[in-house]
Interface confidence: low
């Protein structure tokens, strides 16, 4: 680190005095200080001498000596006061430019350290500082306004009390620039627009920025529109608004509209689409299949997408049967608006009961007329099975009835012993009935099928079981012939004697 002689941090001299500052280092050294007249510089390798024979108040300042070859970049400094009774201030710059929230140093250097107790900062013409101006003072550097604000862009003077009167410095202009974080913020309203030919329309493109220097324009299909610009300033931001008013829209007004704003930081753009139609429209659609199958006891949400202009004048969900005249509860229906012209309507059907199968219709109306979308809801049921012994055309026959949805498949099993369900070890024979007779197959109802098993001789120490299954589940019924007659055994029930 270089060494300065005299080896004091501060030196106070009178105007006209001779001042010699010597800096010595291991290698070559350099002086750096405020720009001021009358200094002479002598260098001889590892030492450098800064001297003046006629010090003035303008020589007041901090002089720093550095050793460029020092990898640690060490330096030494001495502060010189040239104590001029007529000039308490040495102003190093008359204009200071900072960005908002930076500290602004107003470089008025006190020429006499004794005056420090009576210094203050004022605006020109003796006006006081603005409220909330937070500042500090250093006799070596001047006044610092902390976290400067745009509104503090003013002309300032440094004041010192000398012999009971205030002596002002020349003025310093502070320019606090707003930090431009990026291109202007944009809004384009509406985000989408539909109008019938001949109707009026309005599109508003607005941009805002902390700085006034920005441009905004609205373009239609890449053609710039000549629209008068309204300007405003609020919430500490400059606003520029372009409003496109169309009294009677036609098809040539349709297309893509882009709102574009730019400043020196770059640009932002946002777009919207304007659709011009010949007449009102109302379109209903669903992403779901209109034919729904759900297991009884489960829940289902039916969703309809509506695209309409003008807006809906009415809508509702209706149950069209066939089981009852009940109507969906309003609390189970809700609507969500995706955007101005598209809506989603949902009907929630929790824990479906057998009587809730059937047709559900969503109806909507606007000036374009009525539209409806109908869902068909069929409930799935696991099979229910029953077996009886009867004679058909003189032959002993086991008759199995199975009811469920989808249509059940039927399998007959013959097994040894008396049991409520044949297990693998007991099975003697298995017959699949590929074509059971369909007894009933009404829409939205269970399908009932019947399967016949002709048995010439009933084996008394055996069980005959009818099993039915579909995609939902399975059911079975065991038939046990005993000497007293034929006995049937539904699952999970006690044996009974007819």
């Amino acid at each position: 680190i270089p060494v300065i002689e005299p080896s004091v941090p501060e030196l106070v001299v009178k105007p006209g005095a001779t001042v010699t500052l010597r800096c010595v280092g291991n290698g070559s050294v350099e002086w750096d200080g405020p720009p001021s007249p009358h200094w002479t510089l002598y260098s001889d390798g590892s030492s450098s001498i800064l001297s003046t024979n006629n010090a003035t108040f303008q020589n007041t300042g901090t002089y720093r000596c550095t050793e460029p070859g020092d990898p640690l970049g060490g330096s030494a400094a001495i502060h010189l006061y040239v104590k001029d009774p007529a000039r308490p201030w040495n102003v190093l710059a008359q204009e200071v430019v900072v960005f908002e929230d930076q500290d602004a140093l107003l470089p008025c250097l006190l020429t006499d350290p004794v005056l420090e107790a009576g210094v203050s900062l004022v605006r020109v013409r003796g006006r006081p500082l603005m409220r909330h101006t937070n500042y500090s003072f250093s006799p070596w550097h001047g006044f610092t306004i902390h976290r400067a604000k745009f509104i503090q862009s003013q002309d300032y003077q440094c004041s010192a009390l000398m012999g009971g009167r205030k002596v002002m410095s020349i003025s310093i202009r502070l320019k606090v620039q707003k930090v431009i974080p990026g291109p202007p913020a944009l809004t384009l309203v509406p985000a989408e627009l539909v109008r019938i030919r001949g109707e009026a329309a309005q599109i508003v493109c607005s941009a805002s920025s902390v700085d006034v220097n920005f441009d905004v324009f609205l373009q239609h299909n890449n053609t710039k529109l000549a629209i008068p610009q309204q300007s405003d300033f609020h919430n500490n931001r400059y606003q520029k608004v372009l409003t496109l008013n169309l009294d009677q829209v036609d098809f040539q007004h349709a297309g893509n509209y882009s709102c574009v704003a730019s400043n020196v930081q770059g640009k932002h753009s946002t777009s919207m689409f304007f659709r011009v139609v010949e007449s009102a429209y109302l379109n209903l659609s669903s992403e779901q299949n209109l034919i729904q199958e759900v297991t009884v006891g489960e829940g289902l949400n039916l969703k309809v997408m509506v695209e309409a202009y003008p807006g809906l004048q009415g809508f509702n969900w209706t149950y069209l049967g066939p089981f009852s005249d009940h109507q969906p509860e309003p609390k189970l229906a809700n609507a969500t608006t995706k955007d101005t012209y598209r809506h989603t309507f949902t009907l929630s059907l929790p824990r479906l009961k057998p009587s809730e199968a059937g047709r559900y219709s969503f109806l909507a109306r606007n000036p374009g007329g009525w539209r409806a979308l109908t869902f068909e809801l069929t409930l799935r049921y696991p099979p229910e099975v029953s077996v009886i012994w009867t004679f058909i055309n003189g032959s002993g026959t086991l008759l199995c009835a199975a009811s469920g949805y989808p249509q059940p498949n039927v399998t007959w099993l013959q097994c040894s012993g008396h049991t409520d369900r044949c297990d693998e070890a007991q099975v003697l024979q298995v017959w699949d009935d590929p074509y059971p007779e369909v007894l009933s197959q009404e829409p939205f109802h269970k399908v009932t099928v019947q399967s016949l098993l002709t048995v010439e001789t009933l084996e008394h120490n055996q069980t005959y079981e009818c099993r039915a299954h579909n995609s939902v589940g399975s059911g079975s019924w065991a038939f046990i012939p005993i000497s007293a007659g034929a006995h049937t055994h539904p699952p999970d029930e006690f044996l009974f004697t007819p």
Epitope: G182, P183, V212, N213, F214, D215, F217, Q219, N222, K224, A226, S258, V260, A261, S262, N263, V264, Q265, G266, K267, S269
Partner: antibody
Framework: EVQLVESGGGLVQPGGSLRLSCAAS????????IHWVRQAPGKGLEWVSV????????YYADSVKGRFTISRDNSKNTLYLQLNSLRAEDTAVYYC???????????WGQGTLVTVSS | DIQLTQSPSSLSASVGDRVTITCRAS???????LAWYQQKPGKAPKLLIY???SLESGVPSRFSGSGSGTDFTLTISSLQPEDFATYYC?????????FGQGTKVEIK
Amino acid sequence: EVQLVESGGGLVQPGGSLRLSCAASGFTFSGYAIHWVRQAPGKGLEWVSVISGYGSSTYYADSVKGRFTISRDNSKNTLYLQLNSLRAEDTAVYYCARDPGVGGFDVWGQGTLVTVSS
Amino acid sequence: DIQLTQSPSSLSASVGDRVTITCRASQSVRRRFLAWYQQKPGKAPKLLIYDASSLESGVPSRFSGSGSGTDFTLTISSLQPEDFATYYCQQYYPIPRTFGQGTKVEIK
């Protein structure tokens, strides 16, 4: 037809000055930021300066800051670049280019050659 | 400033070849604000692609752009005789606008 036509190039000595013009036609001039881009002989493209549509904002590359001044006269549909304190390294073809505000420079002039030599 | 580095600096290809040029940015390019230009000797540059992948009106569909962040690509799906030129990438946010050093596509 949308067009930009540069003029004003020529031979000038180091330290000298020159004023380039860029005449626009076929579009609403005041609605577009316009840039100057240059290309030294056999080299790549170098962005120089930009001025916003109404002339309220200007910006310069560090290599020309303090020496070049961009301006525009929207009543004449003309862009200008004042070149002062010219150096040999400023020798280039200077192009003006239109910024549509939505990406890239979509219209370029044919360029004008500035040669700085003693 | 954002520096753009193109690779390769030059390439030789034949008519019908698929050609890919890459452009790498020293820091992320905001919102894909990157353009590609074609320049033929003695002519002004011509805009091909903007916003990294949007094809400028009138540019043949064999040109395509892709990428985001710091890595971008220009692809010519089937090189035509009129495509032999120098190609530049350019970022246009923020100022200063900067260009890549260029990629010269020559006839093999």
